[in-house]
């Protein structure tokens, strides 16, 4: 989905006085797009500008992050009179121009996503050559992705007194809820640790103490799907050890 | 004016393979993508592969039907690519189009002529 | 696979309009963008590109070619039809690999 609140930015850098006064620099991209992992997204972005007919050299940037500042994902840059903006750089490969810039069209498309492509997003376009003249959105387009639940980790680690534990890692976004089932334990949420500073999709549920031998189920869920995984205990009884 | 030629078409035996070449000119051939499209006789279009440019690093999509069987490349000196297809099958027999898209765009702008393969023993 | 769907054959009188459609098994648009593209093929030669993303005509084409739709369901006009526009329509879709394309629309004169 796409919401329709626009942003117009209207931070103006170096206008010269080739300016005719109908246009001024704006940028209209919506606040969210929302994307599934693994599916492709739009990010859409238009410009007005006040150099009437400019067909001088420019460049379409986008960032990641935050503007003027944050980390190039894309840039192209069309030459004098061209219509071809000729990609310079497309990070991972994954980001392609859809507009054209020359009809004031910047929109990109972000192909193969990850939760990791869950960030803010800033378009930018600069003109060279007789004008010299830049914009950049200022509050940008949140690309939000959205994911089916995966678990990451699962495992079985050693506690003090000879007991043991079982963590399960998940990723989702939504985060997921993650529940443990295993021998006397019925269904228990099992001490869920908030998502990581960080790592905001990833979710953390602890067994703390096993106290049966058997098998222990992490199921993870969210309003896309659900996943889940399981760790085999067996104790050597009389001896310290266990194989998981 | 973008030409597209391909050539290496024929007869070939079931189980056999063949190389497809496509020379370009007329345009900046670093600049865009390349594929392949085959249409079998009085049939539809289907899409076979895309090589994708440097910037692009080059990557390769096939469609599932021909994965394995199938292997495209570039040569951005020579502004040609080719098609690798090996284990023919008689459902292979299609003439087979070179055509270019942009980088933004998985539309196909300009295509060859078109080169006949026919698979039959 | 997204699959297209377009009637067989049009007949379609010289100087009328001819609206052809193709429909798609899922949505083929993002955020506005629409990546469904049409294609016209004579006899003998190779497809030329008419349509790219849903409603730009291509460098060359004729005003009187024009695509509209959004989600799944998308139509090339012609208007008013001529006698060189005889020939068979495609769709193709881009919104997910492998890209496909419809079987063909074929115009013909009533």
């Known amino acids: 989905f796409v919401r329709t609140k626009i942003d117009t930015t209207e931070n103006l850098l170096n206008t010269e006085v080739h300016s005719s006064p109908a246009q001024r620099w704006s940028m209209q991209v919506p606040p969210e797009v929302s994307a599934e992992a693994g599916d492709a997204a739009v990010l859409p972005c238009t410009f007005t500008h006040p150099h009437r007919h400019y067909d001088g050299p420019l460049t379409a940037i986008w960032r990641a992050g935050e503007p003027y500042a944050g980390p190039q994902v894309f840039r192209c840059a069309a030459a004098r009179g061209s219509e071809l903006c000729q990609t310079a750089l497309s990070l991972h490969g994954r980001f392609r121009l859809l507009g054209n810039p020359r009809r004031n069209d910047l929109s990109l498309r972000v192909e193969r996503l990850a939760l990791a492509d869950d960030r803010r997003y800033f378009c930018r376009v600069e003109f060279a050559g007789d004008v010299h003249d830049r914009y950049e959105s200022r509050h940008g387009v949140r690309l939000h992705v959205t994911a089916a639940p995966r678990i990451v980790n699962i495992s079985v680690l050693p506690s003090p007194a000879h007991a043991f534990r079982a963590l399960c890692t998940a990723e989702g976004e939504p985060p997921p809820a993650l529940a443990w089932s295993g021998p006397a334990l019925g269904n228990s949420l099992a001490a869920v640790r908030s998502p990581r500073e960080g790592h905001g999709h990833l979710v953390t549920a602890e067994l703390p103490a096993l106290t049966h031998d058997g098998r222990y189920t992490c199921t993870a869920a969210n309003s896309l799907g659900r996943s889940e995984a399981s760790v085999y205990l067996f104790r050597f009884h009389g001896a310290s050890g266990a194989s998981t | 004016e973008v030409q597209i030629l391909e050539t290496g078409g024929g007869l070939v035996k079931p189980g056999g393979s063949l190389r497809l070449s496509c020379a370009t000119s007329g345009f900046n051939f670093n600049d865009y993508f390349m594929n392949w499209v085959r249409q079998a006789p009085e049939k539809g279009l289907e899409w076979v592969a895309q090589i994708r440019n440097k910037i692009y690093t080059y990557a390769t999509f096939y469609a599932e039907s021909l994965e394995g069987r199938v292997t495209i490349s570039r040569d951005d000196s020579e502004s040609s690519v080719y098609l690798q297809v090996s284990s023919l099958r008689a459902e292979d027999t299609a003439i087979y189009y070179c055509?270019?898209?942009?980088?933004?765009?998985?539309?196909?702008?300009?295509w060859g002529q078109g080169v006949m393969v026919t698979v039959s023993s | 696979d997204i699959v297209l769907t377009q009637s067989p054959a049009l007949a379609v009188s010289l100087g009328q309009r001819a609206t052809i459609s193709c429909r798609a098994s899922?949505?083929?648009?993002?955020?506005?963008?629409?990546?469904i593209h049409w294609y016209q093929q004579k006899p003998g030669q190779q497809p030329r590109l008419l349509i790219y993303r849903a409603s730009n005509l291509a460098s060359g084409i004729p005003a009187r070619f024009s695509g509209s739709g959004s989600g799944t369901d998308f139509t090339l006009t012609i208007n008013p039809v001529q006698a060189d526009d005889i020939a068979t329509y495609f769709c193709?879709?881009?919104?997910?690999?492998?890209?496909t394309f419809a079987g063909g629309t074929k115009l013909e004169l009533r």
């Open positions: 055509t270019r898209s942009l980088t933004g765009g998985d539309y196909f702008d300009y």
């Open positions: 899922q949505s083929v648009t993002i955020s506005g963008y629409s990546f």
């Open positions: 193709q879709q881009s919104r997910k690999s492998p890209w």
